[in-house]
């Protein structure tokens, strides 16, 4: 759930890495209220996820490794 470019709350679903093409990080500041990882899916959706959750960290780690290899 997002308002303009800000995530307002986190998804309550778990996504598979095969569904995700990339991510961006949202930092809490004067524009956005919460820290979030925004996953970009193969369907063109942006999904707001909690950066503290293990499943989110795993995908971020996996995607970061891929990027570093390139």
């Amino acid at each position: 759930a997002s308002n303009f470019d800000c995530c307002l709350r986190y998804t309550d679903r778990i996504l598979h890495p095969k569904f995700i093409v990339g991510f961006t990080q949202q930092l809490a500041n004067e524009t956005c209220d919460i820290n979030a990882v925004v996953f970009h899916t193969k369907k063109g959706l942006s999904v707001c996820a909690n950066p503290k959750q293990t499943w989110v960290k795993l995908i971020v780690r996996r995607l970061s490794k891929k990027i570093n290899k390139m």
């Epitope: 778990i14 996504l15 569904f19 959750q53």
Partner: antibody
Framework: QVQLVQSGAEVKKPGASVKVSCKAS????????MHWVRQAPGQGLEWMGV????????TYAQKFQGRVTMTVDTSTSTVYMELSSLRSEDTAVYYC?????????????WGQGTLVTVSS | DIQMTQSPSSLSASVGDRVTITCGAS??????LNWYQRKPGKAPKLLIY???NLADGVPSRFSGSGSGRDYTLTISSLQPEDFATYYC?????????FGQGTKLEIK
């Protein structure tokens, strides 16, 4: 070796609650999710939800939202599934299953199952 | 939620037969699909993960294929111990829905 040992069979009255336990051994408990899946008589497998023992994050199937609670006790490597407001349709065998993101998020080890009978 | 549809729902075959079970998803699940075997009175057993990968200890007569919305489980030469019910499962996104099952019976 990996083992998931569940609590024994339960008989409950409609409206009551049941709490099923699943004790894990043979692996690092907090490194794997734990799913709960049930099978009612003559029916197929039904995914109920999952808990991540490392942070207690849970997500439940919509059908069970508000009736199911999954909890974890890391000191004993045990996961619990409590289902409330039981009805006759909840009569089923309930399984815990280890979720392994290393093998494509599959459920690679299963408990022996716990039969829950709901009857007045 | 993603719906999974298996066919056939039941199947009669003989020892030595080649058997194919299909599973269709209501949308593209990008290969995030697992197959399980369940025998009466026993817990399900993982057979195939990631649509095509054989789980540890599973005989090589089992194989999985498919992509997008359509997936297949094949048993190349049926053995007596293979008579059971088989389920596919979506793991692309929770809820992790199962197919309704395919019961494989002795002809």
């Amino acid at each position: 070796q990996v083992q998931l040992v569940q609590s024994g069979a339960e008989v409950k009255k409609p409206g009551a609650s049941v709490k099923v336990s699943c004790k894990a051994s043979g692996y690092t408990f907090t490194n794997y999710w734990m799913h709960w899946v049930r099978q009612a008589p003559g029916q197929g497998l039904e995914w109920m939800g999952v808990i991540d023992p490392s942070d207690s994050y849970t997500t439940y199937a919509q059908k069970f939202q508000g009736r199911v609670t999954m909890t974890v006790d890391t000191s004993t490597s045990t996961v619990y599934m409590e289902l409330s407001s039981l009805r006759s349709e909840d009569t089923a065998v309930y399984y815990c299953a280890r979720g392994n993101y290393g093998v494509d998020y599959a459920m690679d080890y299963w408990g022996q199952g716990t039969l829950v009978t709901v009857s007045s | 939620d993603i719906q999974m549809t298996q066919s056939p729902s039941s199947l009669s075959a003989s020892v030595g037969d080649r058997v194919t079970i299909t599973c269709g998803a209501s949308e593209n699940i990008y290969g995030a699909l697992n197959w399980y075997q369940r025998k009466p009175g026993k817990a399900p057993k993982l057979l195939i993960y990631g649509a095509t990968n054989l789980a540890d200890g599973v005989p090589s007569r089992f194989s999985g294929s498919g992509s997008g919305r359509d997936y297949t489980l094949t048993i190349s030469s049926l053995q007596p111990e293979d008579f059971a019910t088989y389920y596919c499962q979506n793991v692309l996104i929770t809820p992790y829905t199962f197919g309704q099952g395919t019961k494989l019976e002795i002809k």
